[in-house]
């Protein structure tokens, strides 16, 4: 029978008696930075080339005895999870191992840096096909390790890393906190976050997705035919490295941004029990479990978007938070969220030639998050149209006036501290979907984009009575690009996108009381690209 | 692992060299910063990654490393250049006393310095 973890990542159409999806990553080389490995294990024999790279610290303790099988256990298991004959994800992938962790599983930031540099030099000397680098390790936050990962990613390498086993915010660890790296948390057979002793998988906004990481059967270094169960975010990362190898083998031209978007898109959604995470981290942690795409081709027609949360702004009055998209992505909308509800909105602004999403804290607020909606939109030309606060009682409005530009997102930002506390709701006039509407004291920002075949529509869901959460989703074939709340709802904490659903959160109803101002309306902007669909059909 | 940068492996306790002049002083208004791991038990004091500004060439990295060694030697400190980085980030890995950090941060081309720290299998 198929081990649970391979079954979990396999779409139903692949599920036969044996896990045998088409093309097992044969065009891709996966680099593993880990312990030494037992390369003659039957699971990985002939699939893993052990490089001569070794940079490890001495083992701790005078009584430590180097036992080959112990020294090799972590790396051998992970190599097996990525490409093992019986229990591997990408059975066709070839691997290269670098030793950066000693027999106790300990290494250094500097040794890891030198390892990453070794990979870059190898890539320059002998360019091959797509490269995936698996970093099944974690240390404290490191500016230099994150910077090195960024440079390697910008050289076209896909880096996949463990979120960490510290039951903590992954943003406090490296390389997990590097935005360019695909950071993977661990779930178990019940789709629960993995507990490891008193700790467990890391979580938070720096995690991209989760993957099987508990009770994973793989090659054991105890003997050349032995297997063992290991657990951790390393095992989860190895699954994603294998999935990435499969995807890149099918579509070698995929960029890192495209790969990440596809990993997110094909993940199982909303299956993780979020109660395991600390309350303040639940909204920030992606509820995604990695899976192989149902077919290796034909995903190109979709408009892919993901949600990127900023770091917390901090509580000072003028504090701001910034969320950024990856270099190859377009910022199509910007929203904000504050647990206290005290915020001064958000705006899209240019920074270093690229749009970013900035959220503003308000006096007495505990801080805000900026939430960017980052999408893959080839040949896009996007701009932000701003309307300053209006004098008219009908509120501020702005629309996309350029020919061929469509509205992909609305943001509003205000200087007054308690906007709209005693103001009646302002409703958008019907039949004008291409405009953003806001309070008269707010400046309104419309994200307007032109891209071949891009079409968008506005979808609203209003609830007259107070609700802690109001949602509106885009239908099949459409992708959520914008998420905001209709003005006039004074108790709104903010809005954010979860997969294809726009979520508007309000203060606890018990503290708000049911008033005429209790109405909450979630506004989603749903887009699709006919151009991408046509291009895909032409390819097929 | 054998270090490619063998020239810089030896411990240096040299007298003042011509490299140790005031030429190439750091640009005004740019202050290099020092970073270390927030988790104390994971810190590895005594080894530092000196990261140089983005466009720094390998020859400048080597010169900056030698300059640090010479200035440290003048003050009676032993230093050892463990590795010179190029290809991903310009910079070098140095084994030295933490007392020399202030001096190192003032070197030309230095962007920031990070104390080495541990990473662990997950």
């Amino acid at each position: 029978s198929i081990p649970w973890n391979l079954e979990r990542i396999t779409p139903p159409r692949y599920r036969a008696d044996e896990y045998q999806p088409p093309d097992g990553g044969s065009l891709v080389e996966v680099y593993l930075l880990d312990t030494s490995i037992q390369s003659d294990h039957r699971e990985i024999e002939g699939r893993v080339m052990v490089t001569d790279f070794e940079n490890v610290p001495e083992e701790d303790g005078t009584r430590f005895h180097r036992q080959a099988s112990k020294c090799d256990s972590h790396g051998t298991h992970l190599a097996g999870v990525v490409s093992g004959r019986d229990a591997g994800v990408a059975k066709g992938a070839s691997m290269r191992s670098l030793r950066v962790l000693n027999c106790q599983g300990k290494g250094t930031v500097s040794g890891t840096l030198i390892g990453l540099e070794f990979i870059r030099k190898s890539q320059l000397v002998q360019p091959v096909g797509p490269l995936v680098v698996l970093l099944p390790l974690a240390g404290g936050y490191s500016r230099v390790l994150n910077a090195a990962c960024q440079r390697l990613a910008r050289a076209g390498v896909v880096l996949v890393t463990a979120a960490g086993n510290f039951r903590d915010d992954a943003c406090l660890y490296s390389p997990a906190s590097a935005p360019e790296v695909i950071t993977v948390g661990a779930t178990n057979a019940q789709d629960q976050p993995v507990t490891l002793g008193t700790l467990g998988t890391n979580f938070g906004r720096c995690v991209d997705l989760f993957a099987p990481g508990e009770d994973i059967i793989g090659a054991s270094s105890d003997c050349s035919t032995c297997f063992v169960s290991q657990s951790g975010t390393s095992q989860a990362a190895a699954h994603v490295a294998g999935i990435a190898a499969m995807m890149l083998s099918a579509e070698p031209e995929l960029t890192l941004a495209e790969l990440r978007q596809r990993l997110i898109h094909f993940s199982a959604k909303d299956v993780i029990n979020e109660a395991w995470f600390p309350e303040d981290q639940r909204v920030l942690t992606p509820n995604l479990v990695a899976a192989l795409p149902p077919s290796t081709h034909g995903a190109g027609w979709q408009l892919f978007c993901r949600t990127v949360w900023s770091a917390h702004s901090g509580p000072t009055r003028m504090a701001t938070a910034v969320a950024r998209c990856a270099p190859d992505e377009e910022l199509l909308s910007c929203s904000s969220f504050s647990r206290s509800g005290k915020r001064r909105g958000e705006r899209m602004e240019a920074q270093g030639g690229k749009l970013v999403c900035r959220a503003h804290n308000a006096f007495g607020g505990e801080g805000v998050y900026a939430i960017a909606r980052c999408c893959l939109l080839p040949q896009a030309n996007c701009s932000v149209h701003t309307a300053p606060p209006a004098e008219a009682s009908m509120g501020t409005r702005v629309h996309c006036h350029q020919q061929g530009h469509v509205l992909t997102g609305c943001s509003s930002h205000w200087e007054v501290e308690d906007l709209g506390t005693h103001k009646p709701p302002v409703l958008r006039p019907r039949g004008q979907p291409n405009q953003c509407v806001g309070h008269r004291e707010a400046s309104i920002h419309a994200s307007c984009c032109h891209a071949p075949g891009l079409e968008c529509k506005v979808k609203e869901h209003g609830i007259p009575a107070p609700q802690e959460q109001v949602t509106v989703a885009c239908e099949e074939g459409w992708t959520l690009t914008g998420c905001s709340a209709l003005p006039g709802t004074s108790h709104v904490l903010g809005a954010y996108a979860v997969d294809n659903t726009c979520v508007v959160r309000s203060r606890d109803v018990s503290t708000t009381g049911s008033t005429s101002e209790g109405a909450v309306t979630a506004v989603a902007i749903c887009c699709r690209s006919r151009h991408l669909a046509q291009a895909s059909q032409e390819l097929q | 692992q054998e270090d490619e940068d063998g020239d810089y492996e030896e411990l240096v306790l040299a007298l003042r060299s011509e490299e140790d002049g005031l030429a190439e002083a750091p640009e005004h208004g740019t202050t290099a910063t020092f970073h270390r791991c927030a988790k104390d038990p994971w810190r590895l004091p005594g080894t530092y990654v000196v990261v140089l500004k983005e466009e720094t060439h390998l020859s400048q990295s080597e010169r900056t490393a030698r300059r640090l060694q010479a200035q440290a030697a003048r003050r009676g400190y032993l230093t050892k250049i463990l590795h010179v980085f190029h290809g991903l980030l310009p910079g070098f890995l140095v084994k030295m006393s933490g007392d020399l950090l202030e001096l190192a941060l003032k070197l030309p081309h230095v962007d920031y310095i990070e104390e080495d720290s541990s990473v662990f299998a997950q």
Partner: antibody, heavy 130, light 107 residues
């Protein structure tokens, strides 16, 4: 699905020997520690012995030390219990069971997390009587 | 060796009842305790591991708690299928010991 099937039980005289076998299916057999557990008629469960994946570590209950030997053959996906110098008090149903557990890394230490005996065979009866 | 003591030895209850079985260890075993259910002529079945984690496929009416030396197995609402013998097992080290068992019978 993993299945365990015991064999080799029977009637034996005190002082005699028996070799119990446990056949397993699937690669998961070789991935876990394995145990033998026995149950005397009308009594509770008693753990007898266990063995690591590669056979390099073995543990026994005091009452069988020096008399019983646990072993496994990875190639044959089989677990064995060689029982010598049998006594009347060894009369029981003998079960083989999979010790589901997993290894994981903490900050520089390799740890074992044990879930329990999650797969059991149907049992084989050993009767020691003259 | 660590001794495990279960109480009561026998427990009579009715369908729908909430029942609790206790297990005491002779020394601290942290949370390294499992609970099993056994029906006559059948092999035992794992219910709970690490004191409180529910094994996959086990109904949620079963729950475990405790750490150190005191542990409990609770069945929130007894079903006809739950009448059986229950065993606790410690695995603080690679050598294991079971409790003597608690027979749960119909009142």
């Amino acid at each position: 699905e993993v299945q365990l099937v015991e064999s080799g039980g029977g009637l034996v005289q005190p002082g005699g020997s028996l070799r119990l076998s446990c056949a397993a299916s699937g690669i998961t057999f070789s991935s876990y520690w394995m145990s033998w557990v026995r149950q005397a008629p009308g009594k509770g469960l008693e753990w007898v012995a266990n063995i690591k994946q590669d056979g390099s570590e073995k543990y026994y209950v005091d009452s069988v030390k020096g008399r019983f030997t646990i072993s496994r053959d990875i190639a044959k996906n089989s677990l064995y219990l060689q029982m010598n110098s049998l006594r009347a008090e060894d009369t029981a149903v003998y079960y083989c069971a999979r010790d589901r557990g997993t290894y994981y890394y903490g900050s520089g230490s390799y740890n074992y997390y044990y879930y329990g005996m999650d797969v059991w065979g149907q049992g084989t009866t050993v009767t020691v009587s003259s | 060796d660590i001794q495990m003591t279960q109480s009561p030895s026998t427990l009579s209850a009715s369908v729908g009842d909430r029942v609790t079985i206790t297990c005491r260890a002779s020394q601290s075993i942290s949370s390294w305790l499992a609970w099993y259910q056994q029906k006559p002529g059948k092999a035992p079945k794992l219910l709970i591991y690490k004191a409180s984690s529910l094994e996959s496929g086990v109904p949620s009416r079963f729950s475990g708690s405790g750490s150190g030396t005191e542990f409990t197995l609770t069945i929130s609402s007894l079903q006809p299928d739950d009448f059986a013998t229950y065993y606790c097992q410690q695995y603080n080290s690679y050598s294991y010991t079971f409790g003597q068992g608690t027979k749960l019978e119909i009142k």
